[in-house]
């Protein structure tokens, strides 16, 4: 267990041209506050996924009124650190989002209004117990300077806050095999007593009495290798003798999510979906109201009408969720027609159209035949962004410029002989067959399988295919 601490040093215009206008004015005084969201690992999914490591909100900064005509200075900041407690091990790599919010204090109907001024995000490696790390991030024309660190809460120590320390029992030294706890030299590393029998190679514990498995191992004592063989258990294989897993307790067993949160398993752990009014890794943070700025991504917060609707976020286009925390995958609605590629740019949707199509949604079929001629009496046919010529008899090729051999495809069935003719082809049928392509057998009694032979033609005569 421990605490991630964030110290904001300054928020103001970044270097270079195009200084931003002050967010506050004499008519509309305002004050800033900050929100930090932490996720374990180097996750890419910034605003959408929950703040699995935790989140925190700063106090409000001092009220600021712009001096007329003056450029936007560094804005007055809230006092104190933003602190995000974490209960489990510090992951070492983490992703962060820091949002700068403006609270307008004018005479709005219904109290103050909030708007998102800037959001910065990043991925970092950080060992717990280390010194403050300094950072500068830019969001548009704004610049945010801050420092951060992760520190363990006693008795935890170490770069992941997983080792435990205890005061020395003997004044001079620690017990056998136990080191002093730097920097607390008057304390000794405490032996962490895992569940009896927990595999020393494949298991570990962060709390006394537990046995957590390294990847690839399972079972209550982490002694069973995870087999890739097909077994029936929902969490994996089913019996130790076959190398299959005995399903151990799942991360959602006993529902670790407080305050009515619903638990879903993730590849490494679990994730709580919190009801409105609660957030945090286990939905343990409560009492959230609009004053806490719970609506992300520029969502508008209004107070709800009962305790389960403590606040309501009206989300801007492209976002959803009770806190506007989820980006809508607008491409999943397949808005691009005619095979266009959908790109969700956040502020807008773009369709990249296939050749021959245009328009915001690729809805316009371009005239593929415009300016294209088909030779020798061929006609142009549009289709799928590429023109095609339907050629007159005796011609072929892309533009109907090639003289075709109508007999090349062996069109006469049942051994009929093909003759090229100025208007197409003629099939001379073998005895016993008739039809334009010699496709119909002549019945033994002399009657044809056709309803009637055309006048002037006897079965067996060559039939010209027009």
């Amino acid at each position: 267990a421990g605490v991630f601490e964030l110290q904001i040093h300054s928020f103001g215009p970044g270097p270079g041209p195009g200084a931003p206008r002050s967010p506050c004015s004499a008519r509309l005084p305002c004050r800033l506050f900050f929100r930090v969201c932490l996720k374990p690992g180097l996750s890419e999914e910034a605003a959408e996924s929950p703040c699995a490591l935790g989140a925190a909100l700063s106090a409000r900064g001092p009220v600021y009124t712009e001096q007329p005509g003056a450029p936007a200075p560094d804005l007055p900041l809230p006092d104190g650190l933003l602190q995000v407690p974490f209960r489990d091990a510090w992951p070492g790599t983490f992703s962060f989002i820091i949002e700068t919010w403006r609270e307008e204090l004018g005479d709005q109907i219904g109290g103050p209004a909030w708007s998102l001024l800037a959001r910065v995000a990043g991925r970092r490696r950080l060992a717990a117990g280390g010194p403050w790390a300094r950072d500068i991030q830019r969001a548009g024309a704004w610049e945010l300077r801050f420092s951060y660190r992760a520190r363990c809460e006693p008795p935890a120590v170490g770069t992941a806050c997983t080792r435990l320390c205890r005061p020395r029992s003997a004044p001079s030294r620690c017990g056998p095999g136990l080191r002093p706890c730097a920097p607390l030299e008057d304390e000794c590393e405490a032996p962490l007593v895992c569940r009896a029998g927990c595999s020393p190679e494949h298991g570990f514990c962060e709390q006394p009495g537990e046995c957590r498995c390294l990847e690839g191992w399972t079972g209550p004592l982490c002694t069973v290798p995870v087999s890739t063989s097909s077994c029936l258990s929902p969490r994996g294989p089913s019996s130790a003798t076959t190398g299959c897993l005995v399903p151990g307790p799942g991360p959602c067993d006993g529902n670790p999510c407080a305050n009515g949160g619903s638990c879903s398993e993730t590849p490494r752990s679990f994730e709580c979906t919190c009801p409105r009014g609660f957030y945090g890794l286990r939905c343990e943070v409560s009492g959230v109201t609009c004053a806490d700025g719970p609506c992300f991504n520029g969502g508008l917060c209004v107070g709800g009408a009962d305790p389960d609707s403590a606040y309501i976020c009206h989300c801007p286009p492209g976002f959803q969720g009770s806190n506007c925390e989820k980006r809508v995958d607008r491409c999943s609605l397949q808005p691009c027609r005619n095979g266009g590629l959908c790109l969700d740019l956040g502020h807008a949707l773009r369709c990249r159209c296939r050749a021959g199509f245009a328009g915001p949604r690729c809805e316009h079929d371009l005239d593929d035949c415009a300016g294209r001629a088909c030779a020798n009496g061929g006609t142009c046919v549009e289709g799928g962004g590429a023109h095609r010529c339907s050629c007159a008899l005796g011609f072929g090729g892309r533009d109907c410029r090639e003289r075709a051999d109508p007999c090349a495809a062996r069109p006469c069935a049942h051994g009929g002989r093909c003759y090229a003719h100025f208007s197409g082809l003629v099939c001379a049928c073998a005895p016993g067959y008739m039809g334009a392509r010699c496709e119909f057998p002549v019945h033994p009694d002399g009657a044809s399988a056709l309803p009637a032979a055309p006048p002037g033609l006897r079965p067996g005569d060559p039939q010209r295919y027009l």
Partner: antibody, heavy 117, light 109 residues
């Protein structure tokens, strides 16, 4: 438009039972807590019972005047809210409303329950 | 159990501004009481006017507004109309229990 339609009211004798239903449409019923509120003839409003959503384990709450006699329940699959009323008393005579609170209050048209000997 | 108190009756004139209040026996009304205002017109016609202190329901005229004034919840009608004559109930949440005031009969003469 959100619609709440109550049914099941009627005339019943003291100590009798009655089950009220409320059909809900045009909003995601599963997400919200639901309530029953009543108004006795010539009187003000009285909150009767509340049931929260699945993520809050369908927790239920009752006014002292109906505790242990009334049971609120819901069927999320059908978007239905129920009030099972047992051991009815004359003072339970009232118009019963299915009520849902979100950004403001949504009311049904009510169903009349009359308890009389 | 908490008791919620409202003025039993108020009279105003068309065009005037009138404020109805709602007091809690447990102390100051706060945003955590998610206070609501409900209008009752004849024939049991109830309309949710204001929720969560100041959310006006769709279709409710802008002259109706909710607020917290001192330690009380308030409903202000700025420029009352004759059609605003009705009984107004305030409701306050105490955790998961809802308590209504006795209602204010507003007459617009």
């Amino acid at each position: 438009e959100v619609q709440l339609v109550e049914t099941g009211g009627g005339l019943v004798q003291p100590k009798g039972s009655l089950k009220l239903s409320c059909a809900v449409s045009a909003f995601t019923f599963t997400t919200y807590a639901m309530n029953w509120v009543r108004q006795a003839p010539g009187k003000g409003l009285e909150w009767v019972a509340r049931i929260r959503n699945k993520s809050n384990n369908y927790a239920t709450y009752y006014a002292d005047s109906v505790k242990d006699r009334f049971t609120i329940s819901r069927d999320d699959s059908q978007s239905m809210l129920y009030l099972q009323m047992n051991n009815l008393k004359i003072e339970d005579t009232a118009m019963y409303y299915c009520v849902f609170y979100y950004d403001y209050v949504y009311w049904g048209q009510g169903t009349l329950v009359t308890v009389s000997a | 159990q908490a008791v919620v108190t409202q003025e039993s009756a108020l009279t105003t004139s068309p065009g005037e501004t009138v404020t109805l209040t709602c007091r809690s026996s447990t102390g100051a009304v706060t945003t955590s009481n998610y206070h609501n205002w409900i209008q009752e017109k004849p024939d049991h016609l109830f309309t949710g006017l204001i929720g969560g202190t100041n959310n006006r329901a769709p279709g409710v005229p802008a002259r109706f507004s909710g607020s917290l004034i001192g330690d009380k919840a308030a409903l202000t009608i700025t420029g009352a109309q004759t059609e605003d004559e009705a009984i107004y109930f305030c409701g306050l949440w105490y955790s998961n229990h809802l308590v209504f005031g006795g209602g204010t009969k507003l007459t617009v003469l």
